[in-house]
Structure formats: C-alpha cells, structure tokens
Interface confidence: low
C-alpha cells in the first residue's frame, strides 16, 4: 500500500491490497477504493473500457471476460490499479482477432490469459506450420504476445497464441497478420505523354500513374508557378501485396492557348517525394512548316537521279499531300511518312524520285501539303545538266562560218584551225560574233548560243573545228576546206562528238 | 548472317585525308541506316551522325558537323567515314553500326555493328 | 542536345540484382537502349525500345524508362556480366546520345 506524506495529495489505496488477484469463474469478485477524493473505478481489457462511480466494485458472479486491469481515481488526477485474472478452463484466451503490423515495428497480438499460472505462454503457426525462423516474440500474459520487428515476409502469417495446461497444449482463436510496409523508396510516378500539343478548345486530359508499396502514398497534379487546385480523378489498384498504382487523371475539357504550360504530378511517402512533368502547347490554329533537306536549287546530271526531299512539321495531322511539276500531279515516285513512331509525332517525310532524268525534265517541281487548319507549298528548281549538242553548223553566204550549240549549264564554243592534214586543231580563233539565242523550250530548258567566224582569214588548206562545251561534256564539228588556185574550194562540214 | 566489316587500322599524319569504310552483308544494304560511333582511348561511346545509304540523306552530331563526311555506296552496300584534314585529337576507334530491322531514325538501337577501325594521328 | 548521366560504376555481388541508371531530362518520353561493352570488343545490343530483348540476349537483361531516369536491371548477375554498359536514346532533332557509360563490377 501507498503511504501517505502529510500535505502531498496521494494515490487511493485498494483492497485487496496485492497487484494481481486471481478469482475463479463464477466467484465473487469485489475490490474497495478508499479515498476522501474519491471520483472512479475503471475497467479496461483489449479495447474495452467500463466505468463504476461506486468506491466499491462488485462482480457477483465472475466470467472470464471480467479478466482485466482495474484502476481507481481520486479527484487529484492520482490512481491505483490491481489485475484480476478470472481462471476459466473453457476460456484460457481474451482475443481481439485483429491484427495489423507496420513493417520494422513491434505489434502485439493481443491474447491477454485468463490464468497466469498456465505454462509455455508462446505463439504458434496455424496447422502445424512452423513460424519464420526470424521471427521473435515476447509473451505477457496481461497484454499479450509482442512481435519484434515485424518483416515484410510476414503478411498474411497464420498464428495461434499458445499454452500448455495439464500438459496439453491449448490454442487461441487464429490471428491473421497484415503488415502494413514502411516507405522504403520514393513513389515511382510516371505521365502518359511528356508533352501535348493541342488546337483551343480540344480537351486535354493526361494520366499520371503513381506506384508505391501501399495506398497511403499522397498524390497530387499542380501547374507550375500556380496554386490553383487543379480537378483529377483517381483509379487505383493493388496489383498483389505491396504493389500498389494510382491514376491520376487530370482534364482540361476545353483548353485554352492560356493553359498551356507545364503539369507537375507529384506524389510523396514517409520516405520522400518524386516528380514528373507534362507540357502543354494550345494554339488557336493549326500549322504547317516545311524543312527543304536539301537545296531548293537542284542541278542534276542528264540521265541521272535525285531524290527531292522535304521534312515538315504539320499539326493537326497532314491530310493531303502532293508533288506536281508541269501542272501534273505525280501519281507514283514519291512517298511520305512520319519522321517518328511517337504518338505525339507532328514530323514527317517526304520524297520525290527523279529517275534518269532528260535534259527536257528540269524545271519546278512543288510539294504541296495541307492539313484542316493550313496548306503549305514549297517548290524546287532543278536545272538538268546536258551535253552541248550542235544544232547546226553552216558556211553563209557572206563567207562567215556559223556554229549553233545547245546545253545546260550555257556551252562555250571555241574555234580552232588545223592546217594541212594535220589532226590536232590547236591555233585558236577568235569568233567574230557570239550570242546566246532564246530557246523555245522551257525556262529550266538547255540554252542556246551560236557563233560565227570568217573563213576569209585562212590561207592555206586545212580545217576548222568548232568545239562546244559545258561542265557536263563537249562535242565538236569540222569544217575542210581546201585552196585551188585562188579560190577556196567548197566546204564539207562534219561532226566528232567527244565525250 | 547479318555482318558489317570495317576498313583496317590507319595511322596517319596531321593533316592528312583519310576515309574508312563498313561494308554490310547478309542483309538489304539500302533499307538500313548506318551510324557511326567514335570511342576515344578510355572513353565512352560518341555519335558521329547516321546515313540511309538508300539516298544518302544523312544527319550528323552537332558536335561532328563540318568536321567529318559520311557517305554510301549503294551498288556495293558500303558506307564511309571521311575526314580532310586530321588531328591528332581525332585518334579512336570508329564503329558503324546497323539500326534493327523494324526500327526506325527515331528509335535507334544499333543492334550490329562493326568489329572496328582504329585510327591514329601522330605525327 | 539530351545530356544522359550514368553512375561512372555500379558493384554487385553475383546473383544478385544490378541496376544500372540513365538520367536525363524527360528521357521517358522517348526510347531507350542499352549496350554491353567487354574490354576489346565491339558493343553488342542488351536492350532496345525501353525494354525489348534482342534474340540471344538472356533473360535476366530487362529494361524500363519513365519520367528522366531509364534503368538496365541485370537480375541474377553472372561473372560474364562484367562489362561497361551505355545507354543511348534519340532526341526530337533525331540526333542519337549515349551515356557516359557505367562500369559494373562483379565482386
């Protein structure tokens, strides 16, 4: 028993005076509090709790359920408490079934005895299985039986509180562990698309996906630089033990170029927080630019290839495109394509293939491509790189010698003389006129130009070689010519074409 | 079997032309992109640029830009790493390596590549 | 340009689980492949596509990319494993990256 200091308010004291009393079922069980400030009696087992504002508490007829801590007040706040333990055989264990344990902490598995004189107060597996090696346990026949450190590996754990009465062993009511994880990472948050592009008033809705061991993770979507509270919709499931996933789903119904901007999905545990963004482009209509890849001036050689290649950015989706050249829409020899697979792709490809092109192929070649919103052109020249040919060469009737040659790029016509027999034609001569003719083709046609020298100016027998050349070849006409007497004889012109 | 093989080991002085080559086989050369990966002595993998030698349209790193040409050889399934005027900073080892079939320029994943060719510069 | 940042080394015991992260701004948005280097050899193909498998590469390679962080997970780690290991993705201008590369070390 307490006792008691003169001046300094002190505990009640209770009779019986020990701190555990043990009744048999059925027996009376009556316990007095004495104390002039006297205010309750409590009773508490498991979660239950009772209270008796008699100074004297009495059960007539004990059950096991009258098992428990009894404590008596006074009015200065101080107490005193006894254990009553009421043996029943039939009812060895007071349960409360649930149990629930958070991961690396101690949890009781409330099994509180009714008899503390029973012996090898234990835990057992259910159905003879045995418990995880590593488990620890502290029985306390007032409380229960303590787990140490409870794991992961534990959840869903069958268990029984044990005793051995008489020499038989006797089994509570089954417990069923569930072990709520501890955060041991941060949430793993992911977003749908990293980035939307969108015309106004299209909806925008984006899905952040948050994983976690439980569903205790917090989760929100806030725009940066902004704490308006944005409006989201959940899904969730657990996909098997400590697997957890939310969707959080945020929509803009109809967006605005004003909303555009960056998303954050952010989730945080015990442990830490993560983050994911989204960007969001609204424009208030549709685009299209296009990407020449290579010059838009083209200069090809005559019977080869190339290739006329666009990229272009077109968003909505393109829906027409075309390549025409002469006011005729090629049906075949082009294709055009997505510059990725992404879903959120807006770059595509395409090609035009010029195959084995003629000198009369050059010209503008037009890639035409539109969308709901916009049409977009771009357009290629290409010059075809030709041989010169010599068109004509003649002998006029004022004496002078006349060499006409067409090619592209423009041909440069040289004039040499040969005397004699001889083969080379080195001595140059200078043309006494030189123009460059309007072809009848088309502008990205071969161009024209005619030269003429007078043959007056050779005095001895030999021949006149007119040479025609450009970057791509050159080709060569002969004038022989020979003297009888005074007088030149006719001429015969013929052509040699070098390549 | 798909198989890309390289032009041997060069050493060469500064400022000297020099051009290395991959010729695949076992394989449609043309519908493939080829890129070119450099790795320094000790150091990690570098992108050089890439090339569809079915027309030759080609994208380089822009840290590669101007300093090296790549090119192709459809008719005989042979892409090409040149360079007009070496430094002695451009001793490596060069790979090209083939994107698998399905991918496509966006995805790169190269998923053959060449046994390598090591160039020295030095004078 | 996408900038990939690799932990320059990464150890693990064998049979256990190696991870091998590649971060980079937003790289989740786009795929991610990995490649196997051994000391005198050409690299060879682990991962493509985030987390596809080339025939011939075994199980215990997997992959996965989300938000700015792609990662290799080698389950199981084998003596062979010993390698340096690069990741490589594709930024919008179709220009190809890779990582700095990470040495894995099997004690």
């Known amino acids: 028993q307490p006792s008691v200091s003169p001046g300094e308010p002190s505990p009640p004291s209770i009779h019986p005076g020990k701190s555990d009393l043990i009744v048999r079922v059925g027996d009376e069980i009556r316990l007095l509090c004495t104390d002039p400030g006297f205010v309750k009696w409590t009773f508490e087992i498991l979660d239950e709790t009772n209270e008796n504002k008699q100074n004297e508490w009495i059960t007539e007829k004990a059950e096991a359920t009258n098992t428990g801590k009894y404590t008596c007040t006074n009015k200065h706040g101080l107490s005193n408490s006894i254990y009553v333990f009421v043996r029943d055989p039939a009812k060895l264990f007071l349960v409360d079934r649930s149990l629930y344990g958070k991961e690396d902490n101690d949890t009781l598995v409330r099994c509180p005895l009714t008899d503390p004189e029973v012996t090898n107060y234990s835990l057992k597996g259910c159905q003879g299985k045995p418990l995880p090696k590593d488990l620890r346990f502290i029985p306390d026949p007032k409380a229960g039986i303590m787990i140490k450190s409870v794991k992961r590996a534990y959840h869903r754990l069958c268990l029984h509180c044990s005793v051995d009465q008489e020499g038989k062993s006797v089994l509570s009511e089954k417990f069923i562990l569930k072990v709520r994880p501890a955060f041991k990472a941060v949430p793993v948050v992911s977003v749908s698309k990293a980035s939307y592009l969108l015309r106004e008033g299209e909806e925008f809705t984006v899905t952040c996906t948050i994983k976690d061991v439980s569903s205790s993770v917090y989760s929100t979507w806030k725009r940066e630089n902004s704490q308006t509270k944005l409006q989201e919709k959940y899904n969730s499931w657990h996909h098997g033990d400590f697997n957890y996933e939310r969707q959080a789903t945020l929509t803009i119904s109809s967006a605005r170029v004003n909303d555009s901007g960056v998303f954050m999905c952010y989730a945080n545990n015990t442990f830490g927080s993560a983050n994911v963004t989204t960007t969001l482009e609204v424009v208030d209509k549709g685009f299209i630019n296009i990407f020449p890849m290579i010059n838009t001036t083209v200069f090809v050689n005559d019977g080869e290839n190339v290739d006329l290649i666009v990229e272009y950015e077109a968003f909505p989706k393109p829906e027409h495109q075309q390549w025409i050249y002469m006011n005729r829409t090629f049906t075949d020899k082009w294709e055009d394509y997505p510059k990725s697979e992404n879903e959120s792709n807006i770059r595509y490809v395409s090609e035009l293939h010029l195959t084995r092109l003629k000198g009369t192929e050059g010209g503008t070649y037009t890639f035409l491509v539109s969308n709901s919103d916009v049409n977009a052109a771009i357009a290629f020249n290409v010059y075809v790189n030709t041989k010169p040919e010599i068109l004509t060469y003649d002998r006029l009737v004022n004496g002078m010698l006349q060499c006409v040659a067409a090619g592209f790029p423009e041909p440069t016509i040289d004039w040499y003389f040969c005397p004699g027999t001889e083969q080379r034609c080195s001595a140059s001569v200078l043309p006494v006129d030189v123009q460059t003719l309007n072809s009848s083709g088309p502008p990205f046609g071969k161009l024209v130009v005619q030269s003429s020298i007078d043959s007056s100016a050779f005095k001895h027998n030999g021949t006149v070689e007119c040479k025609a050349y450009n970057d791509v070849g050159k080709t060569s006409a002969y004038f022989n010519f020979a003297f009888k007497g005074n007088n030149k004889e006719q001429i015969h012109p013929h052509t040699l074409f070098t390549p | 079997q798909v198989q890309l093989v390289q032009s041997g080991a060069e050493v060469k002085k500064p400022g000297e032309s020099l051009k290395i080559s991959c010729k695949g086989s076992?394989?449609?050369?043309?519908?493939?992109?080829i890129a070119w990966v450099r790795q320094m002595p000790g150091k990690g993998l570098e992108w050089m640029g890439i090339?569809?030698?079915?027309?030759?349209?080609?994208l380089y790193s822009p840290s590669f830009q101007g300093q090296v040409t790549i090119s192709a050889d459809k008719s005989i399934s042979t892409a090409y790493l040149q360079w007009s005027s070496l430094k002695a900073s451009d001793t490596a080892m060069y790979y090209c390596?083939?994107?698998?079939?399905?991918?496509?320029?966006?995805?790169?994943?190269?998923?053959?590549w060449g046994q390598g060719t090591l160039v020295t510069v030095s004078s | 340009d996408i900038e990939l940042t690799q932990p320059p080394s990464v150890s693990v015991s064998p049979g256990q689980t190696a991870s091998i992260t590649c971060s980079g701004d937003?790289?989740?948005?786009?795929?991610a492949s990995w490649y196997q280097q051994k000391p005198g050899q050409a690299p060879v193909l682990v991962i493509y596509?985030?987390?596809k498998r080339p025939s011939g590469i075994p199980e215990r390679f997997s992959g996965s990319n989300s938000g700015n962080t792609a990662t290799l997970t080698i389950s199981g780690t084998q003596a062979e494993d010993e390698a340096d290991y690069y990741c490589?993705?594709?930024?919008?201008?179709?220009?190809?990256?890779f990582g700095g590369g990470t040495k894995l070390t099997v004690l």
């Open positions: 490589s993705v594709t930024d919008m201008e179709q220009h190809s990256v």
């Open positions: 390596a083939r994107v698998p079939p399905g991918g496509s320029i966006s995805y790169p994943a190269f998923d053959h």
């Open positions: 076992g394989y449609s050369f043309t519908n493939y992109w």
């Open positions: 596509r985030d987390n």
């Open positions: 090339i569809y030698p079915s027309n030759s349209y080609t």
């Open positions: 937003n790289i989740g948005s786009i795929y």
